[in-house]
């Protein structure tokens, strides 16, 4: 238990910690605490073990609640004893009865408690504690009387509190010691005499506050605590609080005023009064500062200061402002040579400053005026705007040309120029509203910004902006497109040369729109075809004519495309379509997809009249069936000899169908040798079978070809080897490696490959390829489908 | 809602200087202190110093005048703290913290995440 | 300055239970004393000002008390979010300190 004396006053709580150490039992001690008055023997008093410990006396105390043990860990607890009294005066002995199975040590100990009467008392009493009303900068005392009557020696501790609302804090303390502790905020107003606590008397402790802030409104609490030395040791015997007074600071009056709106002519000057209005007239010193913002709300990020008198009366402007002062409640801003960039809104902002400790100074209060609405009034330029197309499109890549004019009744100024920004709108086709399209902006110093809509079309030159004369604006498109119809208007602006020599905006005056349109009928185009002599065997010639006929297409050419449409072998597969040949708009022939190369001269394609085109092809061949078209394209003429696609058309079908009923042919490997070692002759037969009809083996020829996947690239594409075609002429790919080939037709229908000295690189997989060449009744040779 | 966000990790070299910040937001910045917090891994926490935002005013745990220094801009409601001469010993977490009822009742409401610094060569 | 001991320096404790955690300012702060909750590599959090003030948001299992110099704080029917460390501050005069802090444990 503690050591020293506990010093209570009578009616305050007693608290007297115990805690045992240094013990081998149970980490959860057992207490039991005994009291003795003066000389007579210890009585149970409570025990956190057993119920019935405690004397009937303490039972009683125990049950109210006015005594009770608290367990503040395993190995302590703490005694408390509410309301003390006289005759809790004495001894009180802590014990633990159940700590060790061995004695080691002590096991109990005692500590003197002295009651006191209560001899503090603390003023003031009035009910309810006084209002007091002052304003920002006034100064305010508060008193607080604090005195003991005690026949020992105490000493008083005492703490000014302001409450505001909820909140509480600390404003200057005074300890048992004699020390001061200003409170959080407080340091600096303490240490430098604005804020003091002094005593008046031998029982008043005074608060002082030389310059009140805001922040000192509040609730006012004086709390004195008694402190008594026992064995060296100080020790709070009690603590009484009293509302002492309710601060309330009123705010400072302080009103700006200005005019609400001014007008003032160009190169004149504007002078400004702000007057100002406050209920201070103590030393209080203004702090005035004007500032200018385009819009009507000081507090935006653009506004700006044009001019500060600070609270020593020093000014500070920009140039061309001045600032003076006629007294002290009206301030003059002068703006000199004013121009149409001082056209916005004035605001001036007061600030009082009261002087503190130390030369410091505190603000007391500001305002800031309503906005003074500028006007600068300016000899604006008058001007007319006139628009009208010199050249209007009647087809689309026509050109079109605009000029805009400005008719100027006073243009013979020299700080006056005028620039052009182009607009196009669409035509409207309903109520829809469109929006204008900004094609070119010129600025002040004449630099011409495209607009999305233009940008690209310029740099490729196909829009000019341009300025002819002193007075016209021109705007011309080289090719007008459809997209380009619509409406197009010009705004002229005229700028004023400012005295920083750079140019504003004076005005903008718009033209009246011009229409650019042209009627639009869709190109019509249309293509027939037709064949001359429509029955015809394999061998003999196919003819088509196609004649071409367009509508609302400006000068047309045509270029003329022969497609044929392919059956494919299976029947689930869409037919396959091959270009053959070509003439284009300038009548040159271009072969397309015609890889015959035996029948080069066999296809042709020519212009019988300016609308009729006509398609030959000699020897057809069995493998030429299908359906024929013309893909016609109509090209109107742009700009010289280049052309535009105006349209493009496909002509009905016309089929050509041969009615055979030929043989079918099968091809297959075969190799004595599949399996050889190396430098042995590898020998593989191309074996080919006919079903069907029968031929004479002078009816039958055939294109060989031998390929292989070779055992070091299985996972690339075959390789051409050798070939061996219809009329017996062999053809053998370069080889890397040392072995031979030969290729020899051994029988009518069966071709044989040797690879003479094989090496590593010849094993792999082979694959013969067969085109079968069949002589038709009329002598001419059919090419049939490749077979694998 | 309020919100104090700090700035992100640093490494600084011994002797160096670094300047960390703090931006609040979702109340009126100028109303309420900004107090700055130390916390050394594994450690308690160490007071620096609050700064007012609405005239700038500071005050200083004296351990660390000369090593700290508080300001503030009010357009972009942030609190700038930085520190001076660094060595190993300021290696910790930095807080900034928002006074509970507006000015010095020097109790916090509102933490920033913090900032880690890592003075180190 | 003013110097906060807290006690103990760890404990731990089971879900449900009752904790007390004690905070000795070297001189009389009055009531000016604030308690925080950290968890591990977070800010700290506001749990009780003015000695037995609780903060906005703080569940009523909180509870402070004590003045002049002995204050404690009582955590009554632990949840499993009440681990971490807690640390007393005194908000009397410049400079506000902490104590060194009380790690609680899930037992």
């Known amino acids: 238990v503690p050591t020293a004396t506990l010093v209570r006053v009578v009616g305050t709580e007693l608290v007297i910690p115990c805690n045992v150490s240094d013990y081998d039992g149970p980490s959860e001690q057992n207490f039991d605490w005994s009291f003795s008055s003066l000389g007579s023997s210890f009585v149970e008093l409570a025990s956190t073990w057993e119920v019935g410990f405690p004397a009937q006396l303490y039972q009683e105390r125990l049950q109210r609640g006015e005594i009770l043990l608290r367990r503040t860990a395993n190995d302590a607890v703490e005694l408390h004893i509410k309301n003390v009294q006289p005759s809790d005066q004495g001894h009180y002995k802590c014990s633990t009865p159940s700590t060790d199975a061995t004695v080691q040590g002590n096991y109990e100990d005692t500590v003197q408690v002295k009651v006191l009467a209560d001899s503090l008392h603390v003023g003031p009493s009035a009910r309810p504690p006084p209002s007091l009303s002052l304003r920002e900068g006034e100064p305010f005392e508060l008193r607080c009387t604090a005195a003991s009557a005690s026949p020992l020696h105490t000493h008083l501790a005492l703490l000014w509190e302001v409450h505001r609302g909820p909140a509480r804090r600390s404003v200057l303390a005074l300890t048992h010691e004699g020390r001061f502790h200003p409170g959080l905020g407080y340091e600096q107003r303490y240490h430098s005499g604005d804020v003091r606590l002094d005593t008046v008397g031998s029982d008043a402790y005074r608060l002082s506050v030389s310059r009140a802030l805001s922040a000192d409104q509040g609730s006012y609490r004086c709390i004195v605590s008694e402190w008594i030395a026992e064995q060296g040791n100080w020790q709070e015997i009690q603590e009484k609080a009293v509302e002492v007074a309710t601060v309330v600071i009123q705010p400072s009056v302080l009103r700006a005023a200005v005019p609400k709106n001014v007008s003032v002519a160009e190169g004149k000057e504007l002078d400004l009064t702000c007057n100002i209005t406050t209920d201070r007239a103590d030393d209080v010193r203004p702090e005035v500062t004007w500032s200018f913002s385009r819009m009507p709300d000081s507090t935006l990020p653009g506004s700006r200061v044009l001019a500060r008198l600070d609270r020593d009366s020093l000014v500070h402007s920009s140039p061309h402002v001045a600032l003076s002062h006629v007294d002290a409640r009206s301030y003059h801003l002068l703006v000199r040579d004013v121009s149409k960039e001082n056209s916005g809104y004035y605001y001036c902002h007061v600030s009082l400053w009261a002087p503190g400790h130390n030369r410091s100074w505190h603000k007391v209060a500001e305002a800031v005026s309503s906005p003074a609405g500028v006007g600068v009034t300016w000899l604006e330029p008058d001007y007319q705007v006139y628009l009208n197309a010199s050249k209007v499109p009647g087809f689309a890549d026509d050109p079109t040309e605009l000029a805009c004019r400005v008719v100027d009744t006073k243009s013979g100024e020299a700080n006056v120029r005028f620039t052009v920004s182009w607009y196009y709108r669409m035509n409207r086709r309903s109520d829809n509203v469109v929006t204008s399209e900004l094609l070119a902006v010129m600025d002040g110093d004449w630099t011409l910004k495209y607009g999305e809509r233009s940008k690209q079309r310029a740099q490729d030159g196909d829009f000019i902006f341009s300025k002819e004369h002193t007075d016209t604006f021109n705007f011309r498109i080289q090719r007008t497109t459809e997209e380009d119809r619509g409406n197009y208007y010009c705004v002229v602006s005229a700028w004023t040369k400012q005295r920083n020599n750079s140019w504003v905006k004076s005005k903008d005056v718009f033209s009246k729109p011009v229409n650019i349109f042209w009627a639009l009928e869709d190109s019509v185009l249309v293509v027939k075809a037709r064949q001359p002599k429509p029955f015809f065997a394999a061998g003999n010639t196919f003819e088509m004519t196609c004649k071409v006929s367009s509508k609302n297409i400006k000068s047309p050419r045509y270029s003329v495309l022969i497609m044929a449409e392919k059956p494919v072998g299976d029947l689930s597969s869409p037919n396959e379509t091959k270009y053959i040949i070509s003439l284009d708009q300038d009548s040159v022939v271009k072969l397309e997809n015609w890889t015959d190369a035996s029948r080069v001269d066999g296809v042709v394609l020519e212009k019988v009249q300016e609308d009729e085109f006509r398609y030959r092809m000699y020897q057809t061949q069995v493998s030429d069936a299908g359906l024929y078209r013309c893909m016609v394209t109509a090209w109107s003429p742009v700009r010289g000899s280049l052309w535009r696609e105006a349209a493009t058309s496909l002509s009905n079908p016309i089929e050509i169908d041969f009615q055979t009923s030929g043989p079918i042919f099968n091809a297959s490997v075969h190799s004595d040798t599949p399996s050889v070692i190396r430098g042995d002759l590898i020998k593989l037969f191309c074996i080919i079978t006919v079903e069907g009809a029968a031929l004479d083996p002078d009816d039958m020829a055939f294109d060989v070809s031998w390929f292989a996947v070779h055992s070091f690239g299985l996972d690339k594409a075959p390789v051409l080897l050798s070939s061996l075609d219809r009329k017996g002429i062999v053809t053998t790919s370069r080889r890397d490696w040392k072995s031979d080939l030969s290729l020899e037709r051994v029988s009518v229908l069966e071709f044989l490959l040797q690879v003479h000295g094989s090496e590593d690189q010849d094993f792999g997989n082979y694959y013969c390829s067969v085109t079968p060449w069949v002589k038709s009744p009329t002598g001419s040779w059919q090419k049939e489908a490749e077979i694998h | 809602q309020v919100q104090l966000q700090q700035s992100g990790p640093e490494l600084v070299k011994p002797g160096a200087s670094v300047k960390l910040s703090c931006k609040a937001s979702?109340?009126?910045?100028?109303?309420?202190?900004i107090n700055w917090v130390k916390q050394r891994p594994g450690q308690g926490l160490e007071w620096i110093g609050w700064?007012?935002?609405?005239?700038?005013?500071?005050n200083y745990n004296e351990k660390f005048k000369g090593k700290a220094s508080l300001t503030v801009d009010t357009s972009s409601s942030t609190a700038y703290m930085e520190l001076h001469s660094l060595t190993s010993e300021d290696s910790a977490v930095y807080f900034c913290?928002?006074?509970?009822?507006?000015?010095?009742?020097?109790?916090?409401?509102?933490w920033g995440q913090g900032t880690t610094l890592t003075v180190s060569s | 300055d003013i110097q906060m001991t807290q006690s103990p320096a760890s404990l731990s404790a089971s879900v449900g239970g009752t904790v007390t955690i004690t905070c000795r300012a070297s001189e009389k702060i009055y009531s000016y004393l604030a308690w925080y909750q950290q968890k591990q590599g977070k800010s700290p959090q506001l749990l009780v000002y003015?000695?037995?003030t609780l903060a906005q948001g703080v569940p009523s299992r909180f509870s402070g008390s004590g003045s002049g110099t002995q204050f404690s704080l009582k955590i009554n029917s632990l949840q499993p979010e009440d681990f971490g460390s807690y640390y007393c501050q005194h908000h009397y005069v410049t400079p506000l300190t902490f104590g060194a802090g009380t790690k609680l444990a899930l037992k």
């Open positions: 003015d000695a037995n």
């Open positions: 913290a928002r006074d509970y009822y507006g000015s010095t009742y020097g109790y916090f409401d509102y």
């Open positions: 700064l007012y935002p609405r005239d700038g005013n500071t």
């Open positions: 979702g109340y009126t910045f100028t109303t309420y202190d």
